[in-house]
Interface confidence: low
């Protein structure tokens, strides 16, 4: 589900770029990191793909977007939105946010300044 952004992006906007890339590897990579060796999480078989492979796939996808603070923030916000309902408690939400904010550095991208991940209307 896409959050309400209050406008339609034009053809080169970040929103359009975020729509175009596959953020699933990023979501799975972060879930793997916060779940560790726990049971498989929901529909993800977190043992099916090595975490380093998922991270590489995630970075490859993010690399398809322009490396600007705005676009990176949009991507992180969308990942948060996509996974929000799957996060079981407040601690898990905070862990997910922490890992999410570390993602750009893991991929050798610039981290967005003060990217607000509280975009889910209070659900997360």
């Amino acid at each position: 589900m896409r959050r309400e952004r209050g406008r339609q992006g034009d053809s080169s906007s970040c929103e359009r770029q975020v729509d175009r890339v596959n953020l699933k590897p990023c979501e799975q990579h972060i879930m793997q990191r916060i779940m560790g060796e726990q049971e498989q999480y929901d529909s993800y078989d977190i043992r099916s793909t090595r975490s380093s492979d998922q991270q590489q796939r995630c970075c490859d996808e993010l690399n398809e977007m322009e490396n600007t603070q705005r676009c990176m923030c949009e991507a992180l916000q969308q990942i948060m939105e996509n996974q929000c309902d799957r996060l079981q408690d407040r601690q898990m939400v905070q862990q997910f946010k922490r890992e999410l904010m570390n993602l750009p550095q893991q991929c050798n991208f610039r981290a967005p300044q003060r990217c607000d991940l509280d975009v889910s209307g209070g659900r997360c």
Epitope: E4, G9, S12
Partner: antibody, heavy 118, light 107 residues
Framework: EVQLVESGGGLVQAGGSLRLSCVAS????????MNWVRQAPGKGLEWVSH????????YYADSLRGRFTISRDNAKNSLYLQMNSLRDEDTAVYYC???????????WGQGTLVTVSS | DIQMTQSPSTLSASVGDRVTITCRAN??????LAWYQQKPGKAPKLLIY???TLEGGVPSRFSGSRSGTEFTLTINSLQPDDFATYYC?????????FGGGTKVEIK
């Protein structure tokens, strides 16, 4: 025609408070992000604050956070800036401005002058 | 925060001149840059956005270009109405930053 009309400016003592308003017309206000930008006399433009269409996300300039509060009432097509603990350096013309669908700031109000005297 | 360095701060020119104003970002902002014109006592007016896209109703003598983190506003054949102050603004982040402004005055 897009119109943004600011009000609420005036002379205020240092340490005082003021609430600025901006009434929008000519576009779908409830679907637009908005900014406040200010300009001290004879100086350049300085961004103050940003608010998304649903008020879900708000940003402030570092130097103003904690003293200024941006808000909006979509039912009234209105944007607000509550300014507390005002200082001499807050003296400026305050503009409200619309953020376009392509992210840039496209329409500006005529501005309202805030003068802080010590 | 992203810093925008605009030059020159003042520019003296004559009607008919070709004028160039430069703005440099201290880090990548892609094409997220706008140019504004402001006259004394008036609100800024949008001229160009996305580095090179002319806003509707703006005369074609205004143009913008980008080379990496350096952006240029060019006014071909300066008109009497063009004497004003010009600002660049980055919007790569929500925390907008403006250049210091360039005052174009009559030589």
């Amino acid at each position: 025609e897009v119109q943004l009309v600011e009000s609420g400016g005036g002379l205020v003592q240092a340490g005082g408070s003021l609430r600025l308003s901006c009434v929008a017309s000519g576009f779908k206000f409830s679907g637009s992000m908005m900014n406040w930008v200010r300009q001290a006399p004879g100086k350049g433009l300085e961004w103050v604050s940003h608010i998304t269409s649903s008020s879900a996300t708000i940003y402030y300039a570092d130097s103003l956070r904690g003293r200024f509060t941006i808000s909006r009432d979509n039912a009234k097509n209105s944007l607000y800036l509550q300014m507390n603990s005002l200082r001499d350096e807050d003296t400026a013309v305050y503009y409200c401005a619309r953020v376009s669908s392509s992210w840039h700031t496209d329409y500006w109000g005529q501005g309202t002058l805030v003068t802080v005297s010590s | 925060d992203i810093q925008m360095t605009q030059s020159p701060s003042t520019l003296s020119a004559s009607v008919g001149d070709r004028v160039t104003i430069t703005c440099r970002a201290n880090q990548s902002i892609s094409h997220w840059l706008a140019w504004y014109q402001q006259k004394p006592g008036k609100a800024p007016k949008l001229l160009i956005y996305k580095a090179a896209t002319l806003e509707g109703g703006v005369p074609s003598r205004f143009s913008g270009s980008r080379s990496g983190t350096e952006f240029t506003l060019t006014i071909n054949s300066l008109q009497p109405d063009d004497f004003a102050t010009y600002y660049c603004q980055q919007y790569d982040t929500y925390l907008l930053t403006f250049g210091g402004g360039t005052k174009v005055e009559i030589k």
